[in-house]
């Protein structure tokens, strides 16, 4: 049986059940290389409290559909008096990056995971030439996830003192320049994740090969190498390589630019101080507030919730968007879709789409940007579920009793962007990270 998601096959992936202190290793096409789980384990569970290993999915006992992968085992389990077998179930959804498998829950018999990934899309519009896993768990099983830094088009400019060259990078995947008609970036060779531009020439100095690695609790490393043979004439016989070290800052701060810290014979070392390198619980919340010792900040957007069936309305030219954030109030137009953001076509108000659901909510504060994300909306033709990204700005003089109002700013591939100036986005910092 052919592997259902070939682009996910090259790596062993990790997921964590934080509540029970369990680390899962997943290899969806072969077996994980862990002796204690046996030679054919596709999903290996490591219970760190009891220091035991169990195979909870066998690579030989795999069944697959386009959106679901199940690995059975021969191990019996007792579920409500019936004799079942232990199994793992991975539900796949379309995403814009390779993404990460997320542990959902486990019963006596079934271990459930969800994975938003380009590999599950109906169309190839989000697929990279080359992409590697972009997250890692540290020794305390805390997740560090650089997926939000991945650019689907364009690149980051590396800060370099050399006026004659420009070094462009992407994170964990190659640079897509197709949407840029006239800049230097357009000359970059396909597949490159690190592109050096000198004058009118562009050179591939690195492609992603291995996934993100953790070197210390707050330092992550990504390595790019130039795959193809043939040395560049300005590299003195060496093969180009790029090492990017992502550093979690010691306290809250604005984002910084990736900086070139060393360069020798086409070996480029880049340091990037960014809060995205910090563990995810420091940056994100599933509620509308971020506060407490762990986050170093106090943010509470819950006063923006609307009651009594009213919604914020944002004009999107062809569409009207109805928003009801930080609550579970149904938007009247949205036909009981549990939508936090509802898209209604002006010319045909019967055309209604959920552009993100209120139980699929993430509040993120990273590198000085405060963002509220609603995902899991109605599907687009690509298979991607509509989502909304609301970028908040602090405005102490915002209208509407300080609440302000969301403004639609654009749409890209079924992701809807809004900005929202409000006094409730004014962040209060603590200093003890």
């Amino acid at each position: 049986q052919a592997a259902p998601f070939p682009e996910l096959c090259s790596y062993t992936w990790e997921a964590v059940d934080t509540k029970n202190n369990v680390l899962y290793k997943i290899n969806i096409c072969g077996s994980v290389d862990i002796v204690q789980c046996g030679p054919s384990s596709a999903v290996c569970m490591h219970d760190l409290d009891t220091r035991t290993y169990h195979s909870v999915g066998d690579s030989v006992l795999r069944s697959a559909t386009r959106s679901l992968l199940e690995f059975n085992t021969t191990v019996s389990c007792d579920q409500q008096g019936t004799n079942h077998r232990v199994q793992s179930s991975i539900a796949f959804l379309c995403g814009k990056t390779l993404g990460t498998p997320e542990f959902v829950t486990a019963t006596e018999c079934v271990h459930y995971f969800e994975w938003r990934t380009t590999a599950a899309c109906k169309k190839d519009i989000f697929k990279a030439n080359k992409e590697v896993p972009c997250y890692v768990f540290d020794e305390e099983l805390r997740k560090h996830d650089l997926n939000p830094l991945i650019k689907l088009s364009g690149a980051y400019l590396v800060d370099d003192s050399d006026p004659d060259t420009s070094l462009f990078i992407n994170v964990c995947r190659d640079i897509d320049t197709l949407r840029d008609p006239g800049s230097q970036l357009r000359a970059c060779p396909p597949g490159t994740a690190a592109c050096l531009v000198r004058g009118h020439q562009a050179f591939d100095v690195g492609q992603p090969r291995d996934g993100l690695k953790v070197v210390r609790k707050d330092r992550l490393v990504l390595s790019y190498v130039r795959e193809e043979a043939g040395k560049l004439d300005f590299c003195d016989g060496h093969s180009p390589a790029v090492t990017i070290t992502f550093v979690c800052p010691s306290e809250r701060r604005e984002g910084t630019i990736p900086k070139l810290t060393a360069k020798s014979n086409c070996r480029y070392e880049i340091e990037w101080i960014t809060e995205y390198a910090c563990h995810r619980d420091y940056l994100e919340s599933k509620t509308c507030s971020l506060s407490g010792e762990q986050q170093d900040v106090s943010i509470d957007l819950t006063p923006l919730a609307q009651s009594g069936g009213s919604s914020y309305i944002s004009d999107g030219k062809e569409y009207l968007f109805y928003l009801n954030v930080c609550g579970e109030t149904e938007i009247q137009f949205c036909n009981k879709k549990q939508a936090a953001v509802c898209q209604v076509k002006k010319s045909d108000t019967s055309q209604v789409k959920a552009a993100g659901r209120y139980h699929n909510q993430t509040l993120r504060y990273s590198d000085g940007d405060l963002t509220l994300i609603y995902f899991g909306g109605d599907e687009c033709s690509s298979g991607f579920q509509r989502m909304s990204v609301i970028n908040f700005e602090c405005n102490k003089t915002a209208g509407n009793d300080g609440k302000g109002t969301p403004v639609f700013t654009g749409e890209v591939d079924c992701t809807y962007f809004f900005t929202w100036d409000t006094e409730y986005a004014c962040v209060h910092h603590h200093h003890h990270h």
């Epitope: 364009g154 320049t177 006239g182 800049s183 940007d369 700013t409 900005t419």
Partner: nanobody
Framework: DVQLVESGGGLVQPGGSLRLSCAAS????????WGWFRQAPGKEREFVAA????????SYADSVKGRFTISRDNAKNTIYLQMNSLRPEDTAVYYC????????????????WGQGTLVTVSS
Amino acid sequence: DVQLVESGGGLVQPGGSLRLSCAASGRTFNTYNWGWFRQAPGKEREFVAAIRWSSSKTSYADSVKGRFTISRDNAKNTIYLQMNSLRPEDTAVYYCAASIVDFTTNPSHFGSWGQGTLVTVSS
């Protein structure tokens, strides 16, 4: 691609103010940075100011810091440059530009450009 149209240039006395506008159309969210550049006669095009579309993060050339302010109106897909305390050396053609490169002020990293609007500062 993105189309950019500047307006608001003109003749102004030293110490005066002007507000330039740049209307963007097309798939504007494929670009992440919006910049104002200027080119005086016989000189190279130089960076003036930049803003990220998704947030209010801005950067300025040292020569205009404290005098010029870049801003945006997302509802109108428009970028502005408020120019105060204008000096004769600010005389130039001002261009609006868009880039898919983050953290850049280099004009060669901007792939979409407007036609420019002339600002003349003279008594």
